[in-house]
Amino acid sequence: TMAIWRSNSGSNTLENGYFLSRNKENHSQPTQSSLEDSVTPTKAVKTTGVLSSPCPPNWIIYEKSCYLFSMSLNSWDGSKRQCWQLGSNLLKIDSSNELGFIVKQVSSQPDNSFWIGLSRPQTEVPWLWEDGSTFSSNLFQIRTTATQENPSPNCVWIHVSVIYDQLCSVPSYSICEKKFSM
């Protein structure tokens, strides 16, 4: 069974630390007006003027997941726990379509970086998604920020269209993802 969330939020301003999307009758509008192409949800039915969706209010729906772009600054670990408290996980990118969707969202905020659910214990050990699955560089490359002064960037964030490693303790925004089952 699928949980249906009903929301009549019409805001796309910063509210409660989250970047909100404007709910429309048949689609979720991306978070900035510069993003013209809307994303069509798999299930979103208009009932009595209120959007019914498998996502909680203010989350963005794309294919079979709900996404929350958190605008509160936190370390990677703090961001992970923040997502957990919301019944979700840091973003796991499963496909090139999903990557394109995410890039489109974050490109509207060129000053900000967003933690995703990829980390490693140290440079000798491979990257690992938060759910324990392997990372394949076929999907995207991770651009390193390592320097002599900062040799251990063991967490990953996305900035505009580029994915970087970064020190896990650096405060940043984050993307939570909640997969739903039909």
């Epitope: 670990d77 214990p121 140290q122 050990v125 690992l128 759910d131 324990g132 699955s133 392997t134 394949s136």
Partner: antibody, heavy 118, light 107 residues
């Protein structure tokens, strides 16, 4: 649900080889590392290595280098552990385990007892 | 290689007791530590990963804490099914390694 089912018990002579299988179901086999862990009778757990079922890449504990081989057959979602030049102190239960968050082992096979005796 | 030690090696306790097991790494491993429970003749069962995250389906009486080199597993109120051997495991560097185990038995 996630399940790992291992092959049955084996009795081998010193110097022989053994090949243990681990069949996965309930998830996408190529998405998660498979680890092998052994446990000698009355002893603790010992990590032997892992295989990435997607790429076939392996990482073996130095202790076993030269006589351990991990392989997989993605068409039947099965991982294999082969240990050669067996000695009596290789007598143990061998477990396969699926990787989970933070490189923990969230799902385990039932174990395969390998007895090495002349 | 990173060595893991556990203390005590065994502990006798009663149902309802609070039990704490300590695990120490020979060098810092951040939070890359897991805890397992094993009963005789059975495969280990994951309890805690990432030093403090409770595995799905594990009762909330189990908790983990620590970072760096010193970690603890706490059972807040021991239940009959909790009598078992507990292992810690570092996942910071190869080879991954387990502690020697702590046996919790009935007093």
């Amino acid at each position: 649900q996630v399940q790992l089912v291992q092959s049955g018990a084996e009795v081998k002579k010193p110097g022989a080889s053994v090949k243990v299988s681990c069949k996965s179901s309930g998830y996408t086999f190529t998405d998660y590392y498979i680890h092998w862990v052994r446990q000698a009778p009355g002893q603790g757990l010992e990590w032997m290595g892992w295989i990435n079922p997607n790429s076939g890449d392996t990482n073996y504990a130095q202790k076993f280098q030269g006589r351990i081989t991990m392989t997989r057959d993605t068409s039947i979602s099965t991982a294999y552990l082969e240990l050669s030049r067996l000695r009596s102190d290789d007598t143990a239960v061998f477990y396969c385990a699926r990787n989970s968050g933070s490189y923990s082992f969230g799902y385990w096979g039932q174990g395969t007892l390998v007895t090495v005796s002349s | 290689d990173i060595q893991m030690t556990q203390s005590p090696s065994s502990v006798s306790a009663s149902v309802g007791d609070r039990v704490t097991i300590t695990c120490r790494a020979s060098q810092g491993i951040s939070s890359w530590l897991a805890w397992y429970q094993q009963k005789p003749g059975k495969a280990p069962k994951l309890l805690i990963f990432g030093a403090s995250s409770l595995q799905s389906g594990v009762p909330s009486r189990f908790s983990g804490s620590g970072s760096g080199t010193d970690f603890t597993l706490t059972v807040s109120s021991l239940q009959p099914e909790d009598f078992a051997t507990y292992y810690c495991q570092q996942a910071y560097s190869f080879p991954f390694a387990f502690g020697p185990g702590t046996k919790v038995d009935i007093e």
